[in-house]
Interface confidence: low
């Protein structure tokens, strides 16, 4: 057993039907010595008495917000969360596991540019009873500051008959140094719990390999005399890293006709314009990605040929 | 060249050939499947390479200041990576094949360090780790970290020569 | 997300029967799971678990008769032996009894008769 | 094996009205108890876990208590559609037991 925070506790079950369970001493916390009882969560039966209670937690219905009373007057809480533990793996009952890059991915990361600031989101399909809290930083033996805000839901969606929340948690690294190669990956913990049950998730990264630059702005055709050929330009996104000059990006144009059968004509350049040829109906796209790190490319922005 | 006395290398033919290293880098270890490496406990592999840092003066405004800093660490890095893909890491078991772009890599290597540092001078250099893998598979890991970290320092030192090429080229 | 039961039919006294229960939409990994029955007109009789780790526990009028057991892991077995016509009776699986969001199967039949 | 004794068997109550429903466990079963709803044809649903925590979707007119080895289900302003059987089940975590059923009829 073990302090989530203040007055709440978990407690570490392997959750199999005849467990023995884990014995666990609740003591009131008050400098009364007798008279005291224990109720557990909104139940009028008393469960003990005495200053401390000893509790075998075996199941859900062990845990709970124990709560010792003297003469009708509450003196203290105890909430107790369980952690349970399936076939020595930890339970991941609370997130949707999202496959994305790979199964068992609970949480993922995204960063707009190298200045530390990165954005984690994680899907659940339940809608209450649901705290989280992060924390995050910079390697884990001597970890280096890492400040995240509330999560928050972010998104809710409809997937078949269940309803689907997104949360998300943006999180700003307190010494960025966005030049630097990076040797120790950044560490995201989650706690999660839902009514009773408490669980964790983790992920480990380095922002280089989380970037995923905005889409290019002010992106224009300019059709060229006497051609079918436009010339396409654009600019970086305003939120990428800046001076451009070190912070370089790459780009990909794409014609793409209105049919998406139709055959897409690409062309990749280290420039912020290029010379396309532009079919009637068609649109041309462009995506940026780091020059010289291929972690992921933008979503497209586009424009109509016409 | 980036001589030790303080001069200034050929900015834009460091940039053209450590943007091709990046393209080597990544051609030679695309990312499978985002295969997360770190995951296989690399303490005693890849902790010894040498990372830029961000006291090395690699930050635009350090090479501003002095770009000599910074261009020992990358050659320092440079020469490490070089000695490495030469090692039996990846002339060992299992053989690579015949047009991997390994080869290439390790000569782009030795060119950008030969561009940085000519005959005759010398920067201190890193010693390489004793790194000898007994086992085939082990040394398959070992080759995909060794270049998933080639991978990020390349992609500093392009940035470095893509931003003296633009900034600090006479 | 569904239990279906399987494999209830008429049987002649003595004879033995394996029913199934399969699961569909869900996971079976992270629960007990508990057979159940229920004569004609009757209450309802617990009869055994299969735990998480595969422990299995009976009541004590079916040890000896009746085995669990878990052929995969979206599949619960009930074996039957030397039945009597005490034994007709609907069988239900159930997924954690003792949770909130226990499932239940909707039974199967079974007849003992000559 | 934990003897779960059951009562009363039947009872009626009219729409509006409470109905008590009392199961006894021949020894301590901590939380390990669940109240269980049947209506003919269907598999059982289950109303209430862990001695009093309502399952989602059951309406607030469900309660349940213990006191000891003793819980109680309790209706109060009964429905037409609470017409059912209801059975207390528990046990020790290892073997479990139903009580007797109480099959209510709304008046």
């Known amino acids: 057993i073990w302090e989530l925070k203040k007055d709440v506790y978990v407690v570490e079950l392997d959750w199999y039907p005849d467990a023995p369970g884990e014995m666990v001493v609740l003591t009131c916390d008050t400098p009364e010595e007798d008279g005291i009882t224990w109720t557990l969560d909104q139940s009028s039966e008393v469960l003990g008495s005495g200053k401390t209670l000893t509790i075998q937690v075996k199941e859900f219905g062990d845990a709970g917000q124990y709560t010792c009373h003297k003469g009708g007057e509450v003196l203290s809480h105890s909430l107790l969360l369980l952690h349970k533990k399936e076939d020595g793996i930890w339970s991941t009952d609370i997130l949707k596991d999202q496959k994305e890059p790979k199964n068992k991915t609970f949480l993922r990361c995204e960063a707009k540019n190298y200045s530390g600031r990165f954005t984690c989101w994680w899907l659940t399909t339940i809608s209450t009873d649901l705290t989280f809290s992060v924390k995050s930083s910079r390697g884990s033996s001597d970890p280096q500051g890492v400040t995240c805000g509330a999560a928050t839901l972010s998104a809710e969606r409809v997937r078949g008959d269940n309803k689907e929340y997104e949360y998300s948690v943006e999180c700003q690294e307190d010494s960025a140094c966005p030049a630097a190669e990076e040797s120790l990956p950044i560490e995201v913990m989650v706690d999660a719990v839902h009514k009773l049950k408490y669980e964790n998730y983790t992920s480990s990264f380095f922002i280089r390999d989380i970037i995923k630059p905005d889409p290019p702005k002010n992106l224009q055709l300019k059709p060229l005399k006497n051609s079918r050929q436009v010339e396409v330009s654009w600019e970086y996104p305003d939120t990428w890293s800046t001076p451009h000059s070190y912070f370089s990006l790459t780009f990909c144009v794409q014609v793409q006709g209105k049919s998406k059968r139709e055959k897409k004509d690409r062309v990749f350049t280290d420039k912020t314009s290029a010379t396309v040829i532009c079919r009637k109906n068609a649109s041309i796209s462009v995506r940026a990605q780091d020059r010289y790190y291929s972690s992921s490319w933008s979503e497209w922005a586009s424009v109509p040929c016409s | 060249r980036a001589v030790p006395g303080g001069s200034s290398p050929a900015w834009t033919q460091c940039q053209q050939l450590s943007q091709k290293l990046c393209t080597l880098a990544w051609s030679a270890h695309p990312l499978v499947g985002h295969m997360d490496l770190r995951e296989e406990g690399d303490e005693e592999t890849t902790n010894d390479v040498p990372h830029i840092q961000c006291g090395d003066g690699c930050d635009p405004q350090g090479l501003r200041d002095n770009s000599q800093f910074c261009l020992q660490r990358i050659h320092q890095g440079l020469i490490f990576y070089e000695k490495l893909l030469g090692s039996d890491i990846f002339t060992g078991e299992p053989s690579l094949l015949p047009d991997s772009p390994v080869g290439q890599l390790h000569a782009s290597l030795l060119g950008l360090s030969q561009l940085l540092q000519p005959e005759g001078h010398h920067w201190e250099t890193q010693q390489i780790p004793s790194l000898s893998p007994s086992q085939p598979w082990q040394r398959l890991l070992l080759r995909f970290k060794i270049l998933r970290s080639l991978q990020a320092f390349v992609a500093v030192a392009a940035r470095v020569f893509a931003h003296g090429a633009a900034t600090l080229s006479p | 997300q569904e239990l279906k039961e399987s494999g209830g039919r008429l049987v002649t006294p003595g004879g033995s029967l394996t029913l199934s229960c399969t699961a569909s939409?869900?996971?079976?990994?992270?629960?007990?799971m508990t057979w159940v029955r229920q004569a004609p007109g009757k209450g309802l009789e617990w009869m055994g678990v299969?735990?998480?780790?595969?422990?299995l526990n009976y009541a004590s009028w079916a040890q000896g008769r009746f085995t669990i057991s878990k052929p995969s892991s979206t599949t619960v077995d009930l074996k039957m032996t030397s039945l009597t016509t005490e034994d007709t009776a609907t069988y239900f699986c159930?997924?954690?009894?003792?949770?909130?969001?226990?499932?239940w199967g909707p039974g199967t039949l079974v007849t003992v008769s000559s | 094996d934990v003897v779960m004794t059951q009562t009363p068997s039947s009872t009626s109550a009219a729409v509006g009205g409470t109905v008590t429903i009392k199961c006894q466990a021949s020894q301590s079963i901590s939380s390990w108890l669940a109240w269980y709803q049947q209506k003919p044809g269907q598999p059982p649903k289950p109303l209430i876990v862990?001695?009093?925590i309502l399952t989602s979707g059951v309406p607030s007119r469900f309660k349940g208590s213990r006191s000891g080895t003793e819980y109680t289900l309790t209706i109060s302003g009964v429905q037409r559609e609470d017409a059912a059987t209801y059975y207390c089940l528990g046990g020790d975590g290892h073997v479990s037991n139903f009580g007797g059923g109480t099959e209510l009829e709304i008046l």
């Open positions: 159930a997924r954690g009894t003792y949770s909130g969001d226990s499932i």
């Open positions: 939409g869900l996971t079976l990994g992270s629960y007990s």
């Open positions: 862990r001695a009093s």
């Open positions: 299969i735990g998480v780790g595969g422990t």
